[in-house]
């Protein structure tokens, strides 16, 4: 056959279902390859074929549209599985061609099998509340499409095994989960069931995410540098190791970047000749405010190092600080001469 | 055995204040508990006024209560409801009732306290 | 804000016969809704919560239904021990203004014959 524009593998859109359930995939050519829409395409000729390839198989082959029930049908740049089946896991290609043009993508399916508790190996995207800060709402992901507006499904949640209807700060409001008042008891795994009516059959849609409870904004603050701090001094003899931690709380902020840096009399340790190393460790509190600790050391220190200028700095979206750590040299102790003197006396 | 009691009904004038006062046994504020003041005028319906959540001090309002009512946990077992410029329309047993802003199966309802406005 | 309508008031039945109570959410309160059962001189007792889940020891004569707007608390089987006033309490949030809106129904009494 002709060539054909080929984009591969497109590893980036892992799909997972569920088994059992339907799913609609669309053809992912025309939201992320090419610059026109399916209603274009299919308005200037062109065609789109699917195939797939079975897991653990190397041999393309067509999809069955002639199954019973339709279970697998193609509508526009969607194609549709009511429902899927275990064994539908595999390889998928949509192909957009005519007799002069031809352009292809391959993505991964994979049908996941799910617990009575909702557990399965399904990647769960996280939803991040802010802790006690009144009124706050997830939404039963990815559900669009499935069923007209005029069809109204019933949507249950469940967070972990259990039905919510026994919380008194979280209302299932169909298919959005309201949280009156976030808190750290609430961190856990949602799960919202939509069950929905068509052509005589009933089936489910099953969607899971995790909630995580985090810092709100209105307790956040700019960063804390814990040390250096004025009550510690960094008294040290040359030749002795000199370490010196920074140690910064950041708030949680929504997509904030936290940054902690050193400078020696004013540049980064990068810039200037002495030997310096930076260890940096980062932990994280329940509700993900930030704990940075970057340790400086010098491992023989010379008294030239001990007289430089050595300022910690922390950055974060509320604010920038710095603070001075402070190191001296240690004055040696004065040596005395002791003379005893020894009289020997006749008593 | 779990229990609240309201206390602090009085005959009081009209634009007076009064304090109310509702205290738990056998169980404690310090749980993740809606405690609720809800009132009863002679011979009518119930009308819920205020609520808090006992272990974060969040508090909810019913529109027309806000400004004159206030709901306070004072301590593990207490939580008070404070009450100005009453007027007779303000005359009714008050309740307090655990969880009843979002009802779940832990509610629980005081035997409530009177509460007559009248000069 | 939430308005919660009860109907009839007042309501009869005979002592083994079944009563309906109807309540009216003025808007979509899902299965937030509870019932509630009060005596003279008594506070409310819980009937039911999350639209039907029958509260522990209530006796399973009483049942629940309804979403969306419209409710109903149906006893079958009356006994003279359930002549009462019955209150429907709602419960739903605003997603413009975040607030939360909770309203008692105006209550219905039923009178058992």
């Known amino acids: 056959s002709e060539r054909c524009d080929d984009w591969g593998l497109d590893t980036m859109r892992q799909i997972q279902v569920f088994e059992d359930e339907p799913a609609r995939i669309k053809c992912p050519l025309f939201e992320h390859f090419l610059k026109f829409n399916y209603s274009t395409a299919h308005s200037a000729g062109l065609t789109l074929i699917w195939y797939w390839t079975r897991q653990d198989r190397d041999l393309e082959e067509p999809i069955n549209f002639r199954l019973p029930e339709n279970r697998i049908s193609k509508e526009k740049d969607v194609l549709w599985f009511r429902p899927t089946l275990l064994n539908d896991t595999g390889n998928y290609t949509c192909m957009l061609r005519n007799t002069t043009y031809c352009s292809k993508v391959a993505f991964p399916l994979e049908v996941v099998q799910k617990d009575s508790c909702f557990n399965s190996p399904m990647k769960l995207p996280v939803h991040k509340l802010y802790i006690e800060y009144g009124i706050q709402r997830i939404t039963c992901p990815n559900v669009d499409g499935y069923f007209p507006s005029s069809v109204k499904p019933t949507i249950t949640w469940y967070m972990g095994c259990y039905k919510i209807q026994n919380f008194n700060n979280v209302i299932p409001e169909g298919m959005n989960l309201s949280f009156l008042i976030a808190l750290i008891s609430n961190n856990g795994n949602y799960t919202c069931v939509v069950t929905y009516p068509e052509n005589g059959r009933t089936f489910h849609l099953t969607r899971t995410l995790t909630v995580k409870v985090v810092g709100s904004p209105k307790n956040a603050v700019p960063p804390v540098i814990h040390s250096p701090n004025d009550h510690v001094v960094y008294e040290k003899e040359p030749g002795e190791e000199l370490l010196i931690p920074c140690t910064v709380y950041f708030s949680f902020l929504m997509d904030s970047r936290n940054e902690v840096w050193w400078t020696i009399d004013g540049k980064k340790p990068d810039d200037i000749t002495i030997d310096v190393t930076i260890n940096e460790s980062i932990s994280h509190s329940r509700t993900e405010d930030e704990t940075r600790t970057q340790i400086l050391s010098i491992k023989k220190v010379t008294s030239e190092d001990l007289k430089r200028s050595y300022v910690c700095h922390a950055r974060s979206a509320k604010g920038e600080v710095a603070k001075a750590a402070k190191v001296k040299q240690k004055v040696p102790a004065p040596r005395y001469t002791v003379e005893l003197a020894c009289g020997f006396g006749a008593t | 055995q779990e229990q609240l009691e309201e206390s602090g009904g009085d005959l009081v004038k009209p634009e007076g204040s009064l304090t109310l006062t509702c205290t738990a046994s056998g169980f404690s504020f310090s749980s993740n508990y809606w405690i609720c003041w809800v009132r009863q005028a002679p011979g009518k319906g119930l009308e819920l006024i205020a609520c808090?959540?006992?272990?974060?001090?969040?508090t909810w309002y019913a529109s027309w209560a806000k400004g004159r009512f206030t709901i306070s946990k004072t301590s593990s077992t207490t939580v008070t409801l404070q009450m100005t410029s009453l007027t007779v329309a303000d005359t009714a047993t008050y309740f307090c009732?655990?969880?009843?802003?979002?009802?779940?199966?832990?509610?629980?309802w005081g035997q409530g306290t009177l509460v007559t406005v009248s000069s | 804000a939430l308005v919660m309508t009860q109907t009839p008031s007042p309501v009869s039945a005979a002592v083994g016969g079944t009563v309906t109570i109807n309540c009216q959410a003025s808007?979509?309160?899902?299965?937030?809704l509870a019932w509630f059962q009060q005596k003279p001189g008594q506070p409310p007792k819980l009937l039911i919560y999350?639209?039907?889940t029958l509260a522990s020891g209530v006796p399973s004569r009483f049942s629940g239904s309804g979403s969306g707007t419209e409710f109903t608390l149906t006893i079958s089987g009356v006994q003279s021990d359930d002549a009462a006033t019955y209150y429907c309490?709602?419960?739903?949030?605003?997603?413009?203004?975040?607030?939360?809106?909770?309203?008692f129904g105006g209550g219905t009494e039923l009178v058992v014959k």
């Open positions: 808007e979509d309160i899902y299965s937030n």
């Open positions: 009732a655990r969880d009843l802003l979002v009802v779940t199966s832990f509610n629980l």
């Open positions: 808090i959540y006992t272990s974060t001090g969040n």
């Open positions: 309490l709602g419960v739903c949030t605003d997603i413009s203004t975040d607030d939360l809106y909770n309203a």
């Open positions: 999350g639209a039907s």
